[in-house]
Each structure stands twice: as structure tokens, then as C-alpha cells.
Interface confidence: low
């Protein structure tokens, strides 16, 4: 399955939107920094394309879920959020098209399930952190920065998959 060039551009636009969403400086949130334990190994180059598509899909789905809550709507600029949803939705469609074509369905299901579970646990830790911090502006900024980082890493994986073809 060939992910369209627009998917790659969409990933870059998503990162740009996340950067634009910044409302306060991380420097003013020193005390709120947190280690969420992003499961970087699940996005390693050792994966075949068949194994990565569902993991990438899960990652983007979880980002969508995180930023489409009522608390998120109150924290961020509405116009930027709408654009952000649109970009994520398009990327989910692109990845789902690949899954429908059979890529990522047949091989090593256990490995994929473990990876998807690791991604879900990562987002559970983020959600719990936000709850504990009572969805404060600093907590959201820490999360925005973390998502920028993890999304950037998963985007990099997509690019490496492209170049291996």
C-alpha cells in the first residue's frame, strides 16, 4: 500500500498546527514536567510496513481522542483545533485505506497487539496526568509538547517506510 504524498504533507501540517497551538512557554512550567515513557521501541526501524500501519493508526487515533475532549476544547484555540482534527482525520483515512487493502492484517498479529497496547498505555498515562493536574494550562502545554515529540517520531517512521520502497 502506497501512502499518498498528501499523507506526508498532512503529517507536517499537523506538527505545524501543534506548534502554533502553544499558548505558554514550557520554561514557565518547570514543575509540571513529566516522563510519560513514550514507547519509542514500538516505532523502531526493525518493523516491516505490515506491522507499522496499525500502530501508526492507533497513535493518530489516540491523539484525536485526546484533543477532542471537552477539556481540550477549553484549553486550545478553536480554529486551530478544527484544522488539527481535519488533518488527523485525513491521516486516519489514509491509514485505514491501507488496512482495508490487507497491509498490516496478516502478519505477526501478536507483535502488533503488544505494540498497540503499549501506545494505549502511553496515552492512558497522559490522560491520568492531565486529570491529576486538573487540566491546568501548564499540564496541557507539557502534553502538547510531548505529543509533538511522539508524533514527530512516528512521522519519521512513515518517512523511512516510504524511502525503503
Amino acid at each position: 500500500c502506497d501512502l499518498p504524498q498528501t499523507h506526508s504533507l498532512g503529517s507536517r501540517r499537523t506538527l505545524m498546527l501543534l506548534a502554533q497551538m502553544r499558548r505558554i512557554s514550557l520554561f514557565s512550567c518547570l514543575k509540571d514536567r513529566h516522563d510519560f515513557g513514550f514507547p519509542q521501541e514500538e516505532f523502531g526501524n526493525q518493523f516491516q510496513k505490515a506491522e507499522t500501519i496499525p500502530v501508526l493508526h492507533e497513535m493518530i487515533q489516540q491523539i484525536f481522542n485526546l484533543f477532542s475532549t471537552k477539556d481540550s476544547s477549553a484549553a486550545w484555540d478553536e480554529t486551530l483545533l478544527d484544522k488539527f482534527y481535519t488533518e488527523l482525520y485525513q491521516q486516519l483515512n489514509d491509514l485505514e485505506a491501507c488496512v482495508i487493502q490487507g497491509v498490516g492484517v496478516t502478519e505477526t498479529p501478536l507483535m502488533k497487539e503488544d505494540s498497540i497496547l503499549a501506545v494505549r498505555k502511553y496515552f492512558q498515562r497522559i490522560t491520568l496526568y492531565l486529570k491529576e493536574k486538573k487540566y491546568s494550562p501548564c499540564a496541557w502545554e507539557v502534553v502538547r509538547a510531548e505529543i509533538m515529540r511522539s508524533f514527530s517520531l512516528s512521522t519519521n517512521l512513515q518517512e523511512s517506510l516510504r524511502s525503503k520502497e
Epitope: L15, A19, L26, F27, L30, K31, R33, H34, D35, F36, G37, F38, Q40, V142, V143, A145, E146, M148, R149, S150, S152, L153, T155, N156, E159
Partner: antibody, heavy 123, light 107 residues
């Protein structure tokens, strides 16, 4: 005020061992990504090692892997660098640094630097 | 490992000049790039992170741009206190490598 205070200068023989310490004030090392960066006399900056906010992840430059160990004591709010099998090329000013960012895999710059401690390895 | 190449390695300029320093990564680092200023005998100081975000308290004459592999640090109008050595650093993946530095001297 956010500050990092490193231990004093040291002179060691090749093959020797040394532990650098770095006491933090104004913030907690347990919730920050902490790093060690070094600079040999007249040379550029060289990233040495880092430890994640939880302490669960540690990272090393290839040239110190297996010889240096980064750790911290949360109760003392102190970062450490245990240096074993020292070589002449380890001679440098060692800086203890904290980072802008969030989490084990995210930071975008080293924002708070200690004053640096000179480590000299010579026979 | 990601290699960071800075150019030029040294530069002579005058007060009031506009100066540009470039940094190239051997592979894409997104916007995970920082710039530091270091004066002799002092610890480095963070100027810019996230490729273009000005660190708190840093004068607005400093600016950063770029994404992926090519980055620039620009000083719009050099001041006497800006003569120092400048380093870039990628924080995309470990080891978080630094560039070799650019020494900015008075012409």
C-alpha cells in the same frame, strides 16, 4: 532561583574512577530530564549522558558507554556521574544541565547549566 | 548517530552587522534543534529551542529558522556582547549531538 551546583575539580590517573555530583535547587531532579555535557580544553561541546524524568531511561554517548553511569538521588535532589576506567581524553569541564521539555523522549534545549567542574586525567 | 555540521567555523564581523550561522544535520531532526552562546570561561547559554523559539530573556535580535536538516541562527544587528562562540544541538534522538561551533570575532 533554579540552580545547579557541581562538585569541585578533580585530578585522576588513567584507569581511575571518580563520581561527579550535582545538587539542584529551585526544582526537583526527579521531574526533569537531566544531562551531562563536557568540553575538553579549547574544544567544542560534547553531550555525554542523560537520564529521563522517571529515571527509568538512561542514555550515553558511545565514547562513554560501559564506563560512565548516570544516576540520581531524589531524596538529596542530586544528579551523579560515576566515571570508571578514565582515559586522558576524558579530560574536560563537565557541566550538569537540565532541559526544556517534557518526558523521556522530549526536550528541546538545555536551559539550566551548572558552573562546570574540571576533570583532569593525567599520569 | 546524527552528525551536526556548522558553518562557518569562524566569522569576523562588526557591531551593527547582520550575521547568519548555519547548521546542517546528517538526517532529519524535525524542529528539534537548539542554539547556544558561550563566552570564554563561562557555561553555555540557551538562545533558541525548537529551531525558532526564543528562550526567555534572550534579546529579539536573535532568531532561528529551519526544519528537517537545514537551520540558521541570525543576529539582526550585532552588539558588542554578542561576540562569542555559538553551537547548535539536535535533540531529536540520542546521542544529542552538538555542532562543532562558530566563533564570532570582532573585525
Amino acid at each position: 532561583e533554579v540552580q545547579l551546583l557541581e562538585s569541585g575539580a578533580e585530578v585522576k590517573k588513567p584507569g581511575g574512577s571518580l563520581r561527579l555530583s550535582c545538587a539542584a535547587s529551585g526544582f526537583t531532579v526527579s521531574s526533569n530530564y537531566m544531562s551531562w555535557v563536557r568540553q575538553a580544553p579549547g574544544k567544542g561541546l560534547e553531550w555525554v549522558s542523560a537520564i529521563s524524568g522517571s529515571g527509568g531511561s538512561t542514555y550515553y554517548a558511545d565514547f562513554v558507554k560501559g564506563r560512565f553511569t548516570i544516576s540520581r538521588d531524589n531524596s538529596k535532589n542530586t544528579l551523579y556521574l560515576q566515571m570508571n576506567s578514565l582515559r586522558a581524553e576524558d579530560t574536560a569541564v563537565y557541566y550538569c544541565v537540565s532541559s526544556v521539555g517534557a518526558g523521556a523522549y522530549y526536550y528541546q534545549g538545555l536551559d539550566v547549566w551548572g558552573q562546570g567542574t574540571l576533570v583532569t586525567v593525567s599520569s | 548517530d546524527i552528525q551536526m555540521t556548522q558553518s562557518p567555523s569562524s566569522l569576523s564581523a562588526s557591531v551593527g552587522d547582520r550575521v547568519t550561522i548555519t547548521c546542517r544535520a546528517s538526517q532529519g531532526v524535525g524542529n528539534f534543534l537548539a542554539w547556544y552562546q558561550q563566552k570564554p570561561g563561562k557555561a553555555p547559554k540557551l538562545l533558541i529551542y525548537g529551531a525558532s523559539t526564543l528562550q526567555s530573556g534572550v534579546p529579539s535580535r536573535f532568531s532561528g529558522s529551519g526544519s528537517g536538516t537545514d537551520f540558521t541562527l541570525t543576529i539582526s544587528s550585532l552588539q558588542p556582547e554578542d561576540f562569542a562562540t555559538y553551537y547548535c544541538q539536535q535533540s531529536y534522538s540520542t546521542p544529542f549531538t552538538f555542532g562543532g561551533g562558530t566563533k564570532l570575532e570582532i573585525k
